[in-house]
């Protein structure tokens, strides 16, 4: 758990600045999830201050590595029974310390808050939130203090007077074995999901239900589609098994069949189909990692993070590996840069994912008139007189290849080349020989005399009758 | 460093499209956020909108109804379009890149000065 | 939309001098995520500061940011000729993005 400077960020800098030594304390503070009340509103489920805090002596100028949380942990304290849902708030304070401090004591580093689910007893929560220039690593949990256990910490357990077994008409308390549950101190009937109490003959209601035994969910007046009120108004049945059994609707929401498929009426402050998105709003600043905030049309409707390239969630709260959606074509490497994701290519490829094949016709088109012939997988130019090399970009000489057969000369030409032939020999490149007694010219090959390369000939040929 | 450039009409009449383009120097538009922003004359500035690769855009609530912005991987490009323009859209239309970390600006194009005259 | 208020609109100066800007947001800027910008006459804005308090790449340290919640400052130690311009400050905490109306600094 540390809390210091974030990747990338530029040179880490000490949480203490030229006025001398310092000291960091984290004020935690929970809000319920559902809460309607201004960002700056008391911490209605409790709020806790760290204790125990090192102090740090860097100045500015100097590298500052992550710093140590406070030794021990940060305990809060919260009333009743655990919601399950609710706001996290960290805020991260300075104190300065000497004679010579100056200016105000306390300053406010930092401030993550971000909306959670946690069910009590549950593992360590691990999380890292980004604010401003500073990094904060840190896990949380929710556990029941005793006789108190559950997820919501709403049922009561005790030790086994016998390591055997539990008293008449008690049953063993899971997930405690060697607990049994509490003798009811509540009211009769009194939903052992819904329901608590504190004090005998009492039955306050988790959020989201309501009645007197807790057992009505909250917005449901009647009972909808086909369902019959239960016995001694323990809310709605339904003959047979539905979409709505279960109750598919997350904190508090009511659920209705419709045409198969149901639908969750949500409590103020949740939205979504199961009603799962709580009513966090932008002013809460719930977009870490530079995330910008995008709410709803109006105050109260659920708000969006736009985040930055490299990370994602609700929250923008997990950084994304996004070479591991292999965005990078044609076997090229993947690099992540934080701020950007580059690609290297293998040889033969190109473009910001080598997306481009060099190899490919269609990537890059031949200089001078030359023309792309594709084959085996590969692309070459085939090129006009004159030029040659891989896109024909180079001038090329005619005559090198001894075009002229017969003993012709060769001449360079700027539409390409022209042969003088020997006598008795004719044609565009000397290659028919004269017959002296006026029968026709024939194809002549001597031994030891090259044959023009047919695609020369008939390249040129083509050219001439152009 | 990656360079921006403006491009499009100087002129356009009242109840008009504005079509304006910015080309990115270099193969980084699937990295970043893309935005435009303007300043009237002898004013302050104002964000209009931006958009990233993977789809995902936002425009600013006053000028939503007539904005919309588009990108083009291929061509290394991003484009605004603002319809039914009046006089008080006259101004120095900016591309800019979102930074890396965070919704600021930290490369602009130079600007290109948009009139509105019949 | 979260409206910022930058004051003084002009600041007389000389060279050498300390120049501080204040910007006002009118709700809680999230997390820090302010930015400031300078922009000399005919070009277009330049990033200082982000996050509140970080300089940008290449900003010299004569540049420092600092603020929290609705209050945030820019502070220019020790004014260089190059530094009278206009300065923005600029939210992206919320949308819609927006920019202070702006300070100039101008030579006393």
């Known amino acids: 758990h540390s809390f210091g400077p974030g990747p990338g960020l530029g040179t880490p800098r000490s949480p203490c600045n030229a006025r001398g030594p310092c000291r960091l304390f984290f004020r935690v503070c929970l809000k319920p999830g559902v809460s309607q009340e201004a960002t700056e509103s008391l911490c209605a489920l409790g709020a806790a201050l760290s204790t125990s805090v090192p102090v740090y002596t860097e100045h500015p100028g100097e590298s500052a590595a992550a710093l140590p949380l406070p030794d021990g942990l940060v305990r809060v304290p919260f009333r009743d029974a655990w919601p399950g849902t609710f706001s996290l708030v960290i805020e991260t304070w300075r104190e300065q310390l000497g004679e010579h401090a100056g200016g105000p004591a306390w300053n406010l580093l930092a401030r993550v808050v971000g909306r959670r689910r946690l069910a009590a007893g549950g593992p360590w929560a691990r999380d890292v939130q980004r604010t401003g220039t500073w990094e904060l690593h840190f896990s949380y949990r929710a556990r029941c203090e005793p006789p108190a256990v559950g997820a919501a910490c709403a049922r009561l357990c005790r030790s086994r007077s016998a390591p055997s077994r539990c008293g008449p008409g008690l049953r063993p308390c899971t997930p405690f074995p060697d607990e049994c549950e509490a003798p009811s101190v509540c009211r009769p009937g009194c939903s052992p999901e819904h329901g608590y109490c504190e004090e005998p003959d009492e039955c306050r209601c988790l959020e989201g239900w309501t009645g007197p035994l807790c057992t009505v969910p909250v917005s449901t007046s009647s009972c909808l589609n086909s369902r019959v009120p239960g016995p001694a108004s323990t809310g709605c049945l339904l003959p047979g098994p539905g979409p709505c059994d279960g109750n598919p609707c997350a904190n508090g929401g009511s659920c209705s069949e419709t045409s198969g498929s149901f639908e969750c009426a949500c409590p103020r402050g949740f939205y979504g189909l199961r009603c799962e998105v709580s009513g966090v709003t932008c002013a809460d600043g719930p977009c870490f990692n530079g995330g910008l905030c995008v709410g709803g049309e109006d105050p109260d409707s659920a708000y969006v993070c736009h985040c930055p390239p490299g990370f994602q969630g609700s929250n923008c709260e997990k950084r994304v590996d996004r070479c591991s959606l292999q965005p990078c074509q044609n076997g090229g490497l993947c690099l992540d840069l934080g701020h950007a994701l580059r690609c290297r290519c293998r040889a033969g490829f190109a473009g910001p994912r080598c997306e481009h094949d060099l190899d490919d016709c269609a990537g890059r088109a031949c200089a001078n008139g030359g023309t792309c012939v594709e084959g085996g997988g590969s692309r070459r130019c085939s090129c006009a007189l004159g030029f040659g090399g891989r896109d024909c970009r180079e001038r090329a000489d005619p005559c090198a290849s001894r075009p002229c057969a017969h003993g012709g000369r060769c001449y360079a030409h700027f539409s390409g080349l022209v042969c003088a032939c020997a006598p008795g020999y004719m044609g565009v490149r000397c290659e028919f020989a004269v017959r002296p007694d006026g029968a026709d010219a024939v194809p002549a090959a001597p031994r030891g005399l090259r044959q023009a390369d047919p695609q020369r000939f008939l390249h040129h040929h083509h050219h001439h009758h152009h | 460093q990656v360079q921006l450039q403006e491009s499009g009409p100087g002129l356009v009449k009242p109840s008009e499209t504005l079509s304006l383009t910015c080309t990115v120097s270099d193969n980084s538009i699937s990295n970043y956020y893309w935005s435009w922003i303007r300043q009237p004359p002898g004013k302050g500035l104002e964000w209009i909108a931006y958009?990233?690769?993977?789809?995902?855009?936002n425009y600013n609530p006053s000028l939503k109804s007539r904005v919309t912005i588009s990108l083009d991987t291929s061509k290394n490009q991003f484009s605004l379009q603002l319809s039914s323009v009046t006089a008080a859209d006259a101004a120095v239309y900016y591309c800019?890149?979102?930074?890396?970390?965070?919704?600021?600006?930290?490369?602009w194009g130079q600007g290109t000065m948009v009139t509105v005259s019949s | 939309e979260i409206v910022l208020t930058q004051s003084p609109g002009t600041l007389s100066l000389s060279p050498g001098e300390r120049a501080t800007l204040s910007c006002r947001a009118s709700?809680?800027?999230?997390?820090?995520?302010l930015a400031w910008y300078q922009q000399n006459p005919g070009q277009a804005p330049r990033l200082l500061i982000y996050?509140?308090?970080s300089r940008a790449t290449g900003i010299p340290d004569r540049f420092s940011g600092s603020g929290s919640g609705t209050d945030f400052t820019l502070t220019i130690s020790r004014l260089e000729p190059e530094d009278f311009a206009v300065y923005y400050c600029q939210q992206y905490g919320t949308s819609p993005l927006t920019f202070g109306g702006g300070t100039k600094v101008e030579i006393k």
């Open positions: 709700q809680r800027v999230s997390n820090t995520y």
């Open positions: 800019a890149r979102v930074f890396h970390w965070g919704f600021a600006f930290d490369i």
């Open positions: 996050g509140a308090s």
């Open positions: 958009i990233y690769y993977s789809g995902t855009t």
